[in-house]
């Protein structure tokens, strides 16, 4: 039996009597015979060659067709040459007829010949003579006929003898199906062939265990009328953690992984990573090593860098310049940046607190790509510790102790801080009297204050200055009816402080002696 055939009847496979219906009973006879290999089998023989007009029918038992539509009938038979039978030339024939009758159930033992549909007249390609009998040359003829499409649940086959000397050695009834196969990691189930010789049945495959359909490429095959699968379309691919082995998806072994179904094969775990179970889609990082969220699974696990090297500093009053060399170990990454941590420390116990937000960093405090920074606006005569930490993409994932280079310094004299609380005390046509408060941080002895003023319309293109040692002053020789801008800064031995915010004051008009309040307008600080 070829793999693509599903047997509905095989007379050779039956050890007991077939007990088919013979009509008349003196016609076809069931006897034990031999097949082509001289194996005993049940055969039906008829050799009614003496009388003319033979009409001997042999009918099989009812054959359920299952879900078949096209049925094949294979007959193996031997036919004796009429010339080997003396004296019967007028009555002996060398053909027989094959019929079928469709029905939904077993109709009993009566053969109603008129209901049967003729399939074909069967003739032998080879008949054998008396001489062949002696040599045991039982010449076996094989004929295959097709019936269908069938519409009922089953059918009978019938053989009509019209006067031949014949032995039915084998009757095989089958239909063809495409047997379940695995192709492109898809299982295609047993599929019965179509009802027509040229028909193709499209079948959708189901992915094998641990496989999935390739995107927008569902696996399909066509089952041909001959029971053969035709060229596959689409495919399944092994899921993450699995790779193809023959017709199956096998899990990646330990120390291997496959992160995507698109990858063909499992890969060895990248450096500093491992998988201690089968079927891994990614490898876990070793202790102390990490994978950044943006790192693809195929890159090595990395660790935070070591501390920057050769940290040096330069102090200029309340400004510190820091410079360093890259870390000896970048942790296996090339995204190293630096961040600066500033701590202000007390003189006594050496306790330190973060510097706060009023400190300036140039170019920036974190995310430094270059290996230098300038820290500004420090307090004068204060102790500071600066920690320079090298950072990479996995530093924030690490729970281990930070690695940094540190330096402790003491700042020198600093310029005073900004003057505050500038007020106009009196405004006249040609003079304005101002007062202010001492800076919050004088950073030494204030030697004088410098007042800068200019007509607002001039936008500082030309300005005048006036110096005073006190915290008030009268500015004279102004134009009546004009808006002036005033800014004040403190001066110490260490230098100039920053100017106070701008204060706009309008002098009185000449015609009127009336005083009025000018509105103070503060603006951004002007640099020295």
């Amino acid at each position: 039996q070829a793999a693509k055939e599903v047997l509905l009847l095989d007379s050779k496979a039956q050890q007991t009597e077939l007990e088919w219906i013979s009509s008349p009973p003196s016609g076809w006879e069931e006897i034990s015979g031999l097949d082509e290999n001289y194996t005993p089998i049940r055969t039906y023989q008829v050799c009614q060659v003496m009388e003319p007009n033979q009409n001997n029918w042999l009918r099989t038992n009812w054959i359920s067709k299952g879900n078949a539509q096209r049925i094949f009938v294979e007959l193996k038979f031997t036919l004796r040459d009429c010339n080997s039978l003396p004296g019967v030339l007028g009555t002996c024939k060398e053909t027989f007829n094959l019929y079928y009758y469709e029905t939904d159930y077993d109709t009993g033992r009566n053969i109603r010949e008129n209901l049967y549909v003729k399939i074909d007249t069967i003739a032998a390609d080879e008949s054998f003579t008396q001489g062949d009998l002696g040599e045991r040359k039982m010449k076996l003829n094989t004929e295959v006929r097709e019936i269908g499409p069938l519409s009922k649940k089953g059918f009978y086959l019938a053989f009509q003898d019209v006067g031949a000397c014949i032995a039915l050695v084998s009757v095989k009834v089958y239909y063809k199906k495409c047997w379940s196969i695995v192709e492109n990691l898809a299982v295609f189930p047993d599929t019965v062939t179509g009802s027509e010789f040229s028909s193709l049945v499209e079948v959708r495959g189901t992915c094998v265990s641990s496989a999935e359909e390739e995107a927008e490429n569902s696996p399909r095959m066509h089952c041909s009328a001959e029971g053969e699968w035709l060229v596959p379309i689409g495919k399944c691919i092994c899921k993450a953690g699995y790779q193809q082995k023959g017709d199956t998806c096998e899990p990646c072994g330990r120390r291997f992984y496959k992160s995507s179904s698109q990858d063909l094969q499992c890969s060895r775990c990248p450096t500093h990573s491992f998988s201690d179970r089968e079927g891994s889609s990614r490898c876990e990082c070793e202790d102390g090593y990490y994978r950044a969220p943006s790192d693809p699974p195929y890159v090595a696990c990395t660790r935070p860098p070591s501390a920057p090297q050769n940290l040096i500093f330069n102090i200029n009053q309340t400004t510190v310049s820091l410079e360093w060399s890259p870390p000896a170990d970048n942790g296996g990454r090339n995204d190293v940046t630096y961040r600066i941590l500033c701590k202000r420390c007390s003189w006594e116990q050496g306790e330190c607190v973060p510097c706060g937000s009023n400190i300036g960093y140039m170019p920036q405090q974190t995310g430094l790509e270059d290996n230098y920074v300038t820290v500004m606006d420090l307090l004068a005569h204060a102790n500071y510790t600066f920690e320079v930490e090298a950072v990479n993409g996995v530093s924030d994932l690490s729970r281990s102790q930070r690695l940094f280079a540190a330096v402790s310094i003491t700042t020198g004299q600093a310029a005073p801080s900004q003057v505050s609380g500038v007020m106009k005390e009196r405004v006249l046509q040609r003079s304005v009297q101002l007062s202010w408060q001492e800076p919050e941080h004088p950073n030494g002895v204030i030697t004088e204050y410098e007042i800068k003023y200019y007509e607002k319309d001039q936008r500082e293109r030309t300005y005048s200055t006036l110096k005073t040692k006190s915290t008030s002053a009268s500015i004279n020789n102004l134009k009546p009816g004009t808006v002036y801008v005033f800014q004040i800064r403190a001066v110490t031995a260490a230098g100039y402080g920053n100017y106070s915010p701008r204060l706009d004051v309008a002098t009185l008009e000449e015609a009127s002696g009336k005083m009025f309040e000018a509105t103070a307008v503060s603006s951004e600080q002007n640099p020295v």
Epitope: S26, G33, L34, Q45, C47, Q48, V49, M50, E51, P52, T78, L79, R80, L85, P86, G87, V88, G90, T91, Q130, G131, L133, G134, R136, M138, C165, I166, A167
Partner: antibody, heavy 121, light 106 residues
Framework: QVQLLQSGAEVKKPGASVKVPCKAS????????MSWVRQAPGQGLEWMGW????????TYAQGSTGRFVFSLDTSVSTAYLQISSLKAEDTAVYYC??????????????WGQGTLVTVSS | EIVLTQSPATLSVSPGERATLSCRAS??????PAWYQQKPGQAPRLLIY???TRATGIPDRFSASGSGTDFTLTISRVEPEDFAVYYC????????FGQGTKVEIK
Amino acid sequence: QVQLLQSGAEVKKPGASVKVPCKASGYTFTSRAMSWVRQAPGQGLEWMGWINTNTGNPTYAQGSTGRFVFSLDTSVSTAYLQISSLKAEDTAVYYCARVRFTVYGDGMDVWGQGTLVTVSS
Amino acid sequence: EIVLTQSPATLSVSPGERATLSCRASQSVSSNPAWYQQKPGQAPRLLIYGASTRATGIPDRFSASGSGTDFTLTISRVEPEDFAVYYCQQYGPSWTFGQGTKVEIK
């Protein structure tokens, strides 16, 4: 039940004739050929020939003389063996036997009980 | 004319034993012989025809084989009712019998 019924023993003088009947029953007489076999006392079997019961066409064994004639009466399903000019050496049991043709070979599957013909002066 | 020679003429066996009867043709025959059994006072009985087909009602201890000129009838285990004379017969254009083998009780 298929049967071949033959007549009882016959005693004949040399030169006489005898006609041995063989009546068939239990099957269609004309569907099978009929063969004749004789067995001399204490001897083996000797095939004499056969007749096509449908056409009446006889086939005689090689070396057979014209003294043996096979005939039929299909109306009574009977075959006959007639021996003329009997000789002492014709003394034997005469059997009719139905011929069985098959695809794979032939044989005589049903035998009459035999008719003993004795030729004696 | 083809002559069939059977041997031995007499075969003595005990019940239950195997009996092997030979039939040799004077020339290669065109068919395998049929085999017959004949008991005293009875008509012959067809045992085997068509090379190896047992006739209706014949037990399967009887089997036949051979080709060309040498043929054999085997009784695998002789039963008491098997003691008889056995004839081979070839069927061609002219049918002939062997002279017979007598199987007797040892």
